[in-house]
Amino acid sequence: MMTGTIETTGNISAEKGGSIILQCHLSSTTAQVTQVNWEQQDQLLAICNADLGWHISPSFKDRVAPGPGLGLTLQSLTVNDTGEYFCIYHTYPDGTYTGRIFLEVLESSVAEHGARFQIPTGDYKDDDDKPNKGSGTTS
């Protein structure tokens, strides 16, 4: 039974040209995390793997930095970066936990950070839902 919850930075906004930290935290489970994937809609942004460390997708290398921790820093934001981001925690023995963050990139200086929210264990994605994600990243 999956008992964990993922806390994320929730709905956030940032200014065009600025940077933002995407952060998730898995808690309330003693499952051990073996890999964390960061995805934007259907694109893989980055992987933090227990054995191999961080891997940033080539198309995002210039604008994505690993950390802090298991989080991800997006730099030189554009309006096209607006959208959903997912942190996907691969754990043993629980399986996969997924957290969602919505980022809105604004032209003006009205950007504000939204409140944190929690995604309960019910928001769960099986590895089979993502057949092409993260394959070949573990050794």
């Epitope: 051990q32 921790g69 050794s139």
Partner: antibody, heavy 119, light 113 residues
Framework: EVQLVESGGGLVQPGGSLRLSCAAS????????MSWVRQAPGKGLEWVAY????????YYPDTVKGRFTISRDNAKNSLYLQMNSLRAEDTAVYYC????????????WGQGTTVTVSS | DIQMTQSPSSLSASVGDRVTITCKSS????????????LAWYQQKPGKAPKLLIY???TRESGVPSRFSGSGSGTDFTLTISSLQPEDFAVYYC?????????FGGGTKVEIK
């Protein structure tokens, strides 16, 4: 150079409390998970507490659960272990140890601080 | 809890000897998802903190001499010192980091014959 320096050990009576500290330097403390591991006199090693990089997760073995609390202050590069309701069997050298994210072995250890629980 | 059993508990050896220490776990330490064995080996000298030697069962930590090697998978693991040096006389511990609570073997003391 990575350095972990424990302090706060000493003699305490059964049922008493003690707070251990670990000062970290030479690395980005907030990017690492941390644990406390103890070693009773002449005995082996026993892991007693874990805290994640941001302090969101803490785990304990049953032997100390409910009595020990691990915490950290990333702004001060410091790790703590609050020990309550101490027992004679808690007598040990207590080490703080660093863990790389997603790896759960201990890659650096402090020199240890001695806790003696005795009346 | 996963029990870790080391053998022998102590051994006497001479400089230049090949030394083998075994560690058995009560359940498999192999993760199928990444094919990694979650086992580490440490060396501890009297009055000193433990020092990491090997992780993932067979990966040598940076700076550890090549005479130290780890092997094994699943539940059976071995630490080998190919040619014992004077500075290698110490206590050696295995540790599983596969599941909470993380547990250590009882230790193997390597003494001078």
């Amino acid at each position: 150079e990575v350095q972990l320096v424990e302090s706060g050990g000493g003699l305490v009576q059964p049922g008493g409390s003690l707070r251990l500290s670990c000062a970290a330097s030479g690395f980005a403390f907030s990017d690492y998970d941390m644990s406390w591991v103890r070693q009773a006199p002449g005995k082996g090693l026993e892991w007693v507490a874990y805290i994640s990089d941001g302090g969101y997760n803490t785990y304990y073995p049953d032997t100390v659960k409910g009595r020990f609390t691990i915490s950290r202050d990333n702004a001060k590069n410091s790790l703590y272990l609050q020990m309550n309701s101490l027992r004679a069997e808690d007598t040990a050298v207590y080490y703080c140890a660093r863990q790389i994210l997603l790896r759960y072995y201990f890659d650096y250890w402090g020199q240890g601080t001695t806790v003696t629980v005795s009346s | 809890d996963i029990q870790m059993t080391q053998s022998p508990s102590s051994l006497s050896a001479s400089v230049g000897d090949r030394v083998t220490i075994t560690c058995k776990s009560s359940q498999s330490l192999l993760y199928s998802s990444n094919q990694k064995n979650y086992l580490a080996w440490y060396q501890q000298k009297p009055g000193k903190a433990p020092k990491l030697l090997i992780y993932w069962a067979s990966t040598r930590e940076s700076g550890v001499p090549s005479r130290f090697s780890g092997s094994g998978s699943g539940t059976d693991f071995t630490l080998t010192i190919s040619s014992l040096q004077p500075e290698d006389f110490a206590v050696y511990y295995c540790q599983q980091y596969h599941s909470y609570p993380w547990t250590f073997g009882g230790g193997t003391k390597v003494e001078i014959k």
